[in-house]
């Protein structure tokens, strides 16, 4: 018996109620493998979710999401608001970076700006809360005479590490 | 799957310093931040710092300045602390743990094993 | 300075229902999202409870969270209560996004 149902091809399942005839699946339903007892039922793409890939007997349908908002997690599972350049979402919406961090996307959160110092280097363009300081050779490689190119130091939050 | 594993416990005398280490596994290291927490036996825990490994960049508590350093190593996706100057009052466990990039005020998703560190003479 | 206030011990009896609290001193609790953590001793934390009242895959649905606007805080509900889940549980939440805040925590003793 188990045998027949191995026939079974996706987009179809074995009817138990008909002698495990394959049948094929209902409407909004599918089955992407053979040999299945049931059909899963078809994922629909409503409210913040909007259909990229209609759902046919052998494939479940796939979402994307409205604009204004943006894919999270396995297969589009959730849809996140958008933030503009130099915001992060949180439980309020979209809050601007905190001083001495960034962000260069409408998703994601705030990171902090490059420690150039890490590198021995010195800060050649300050940062700001849509782009992280852009690092420049150290003060010793700058010729004798020559003008240091790092910005004054900005007043800082607590917390933040200078750069 | 997602892992943060930290280092041995450590014994210092007052005055010295010590680095602890938490390698991250199962994930993509640069692009989630750091926590670093403390929590003396049988007290709360205490938010020290955290560090973006994916560029360096650092924020520290204010009770905490002066007395920790984070680094990264992202070759070995492995965050450190330095603990300097050491006193008793630093005979804590200190947590590593990681937040999701969902949100700015998001959760730790995932907790490092959690480290012993002992100042005695 | 933004602090979040919990009762340092709460017990219960087995079976029972209980609401640990979490009341922030300043601001708007709804400000920010509250995630709570329950640690047994000698363990690191584990979330219960994420972005007020989200239940992580693997917690049993006993644990549920909420908030209160009218009192400033923060609950973590825990329903049919069980020997296991004797341990102290904290409270999490932000001064700003760059500084997270805890709770003192509340040890919960099963009776």
């Known amino acids: 018996l188990q045998d027949l149902c191995s026939n079974c091809p996706a987009g179809t399942f074995c009817d138990n109620n008909r002698s495990q005839i394959c049948s094929p699946c209902p409407p909004n339903s599918f089955s992407s493998a053979g040999g299945q007892r049931t059909c899963d039922i078809c994922r629909q793409c409503k409210g913040v979710f909007k259909t990229r890939k209609e759902c046919s007997s052998t494939s479940n349908a796939e979402c994307d999401c409205i604009s204004g908002y943006h894919c999270l997690g396995a297969e589009c599972s959730m849809c996140e608001q958008d933030c503009k350049q130099g915001q992060e979402l949180t439980k309020k919406g979209c809050k601007d970076c905190c001083f001495g961090t960034f962000n260069d996307q409408k998703r994601g959160i705030c990171r902090p700006w490059t420690n150039c110092s890490l590198d021995g280097k010195s800060v050649l363009v300050n940062g700001t809360k849509e782009r992280d300081v852009v690092c420049g050779p150290s003060p010793a490689d700058l010729s004798p005479g020559a003008s240091s190119a790092t910005p004054p130091a900005p007043a800082r939050e607590p917390g933040h590490s200078p750069q | 799957q997602v892992q943060l594993q930290q280092s041995g416990a450590e014994l210092a005398k007052p005055g010295t310093s010590v680095k602890l280490s938490c390698k991250a596994s199962?994930?993509?290291?640069?692009?989630?931040?750091i926590y670093w927490v403390k929590q003396r036996p049988g007290q709360g825990l205490e938010w020290i710092g955290n560090?973006?490994?994916?560029?360096?960049?650092?924020f520290y508590g204010e009770k905490f300045m002066g007395k920790a350093t984070f680094t990264a190593d992202t070759s070995s996706s492995t965050a450190y602390m330095l603990l300097g100057s050491l006193t008793p009052e630093d005979s804590a466990y200190y947590f590593c743990?990681?937040?999701?990039?969902?949100?700015?005020?998001?959760?730790?998703?995932?907790w490092g094993q959690g480290v012993l560190v002992t100042v005695s003479s | 300075q933004v602090v979040l206030t919990q009762p340092k011990s709460v017990s219960t009896s087995l079976k029972s229902t209980v609401k640990l609290s979490c009341k922030l001193n300043?601001?708007?609790?709804?400000?920010?999202?509250v995630h709570w953590y329950q640690q047994h001793a000698g363990r690191s934390p584990t979330t219960m409870i994420y972005r007020d009242d989200k239940r992580p895959d693997g917690v049993p649905d006993r644990f549920s969270g909420s908030i209160d606007s009218s009192s400033n805080s923060a609950f973590l509900t825990i329903n049919n209560v069980q020997t296991e889940d004797d341990a102290i549980y904290f409270c999490?939440?932000?001064?700003?996004?760059?500084?997270?805040?805890f709770g003192g925590g509340t040890k919960l003793t099963v009776l």
């Open positions: 199962g994930y993509t290291f640069t692009s989630y931040y």
């Open positions: 300043s601001g708007n609790i709804g400000s920010y999202y």
């Open positions: 999490h939440s932000y001064d700003s996004t760059i500084t997270p805040v």
């Open positions: 743990a990681r937040r999701p990039d969902y949100s700015g005020d998001d959760y730790f998703d995932y």
């Open positions: 560090i973006w490994p994916g560029n360096g960049g650092t």
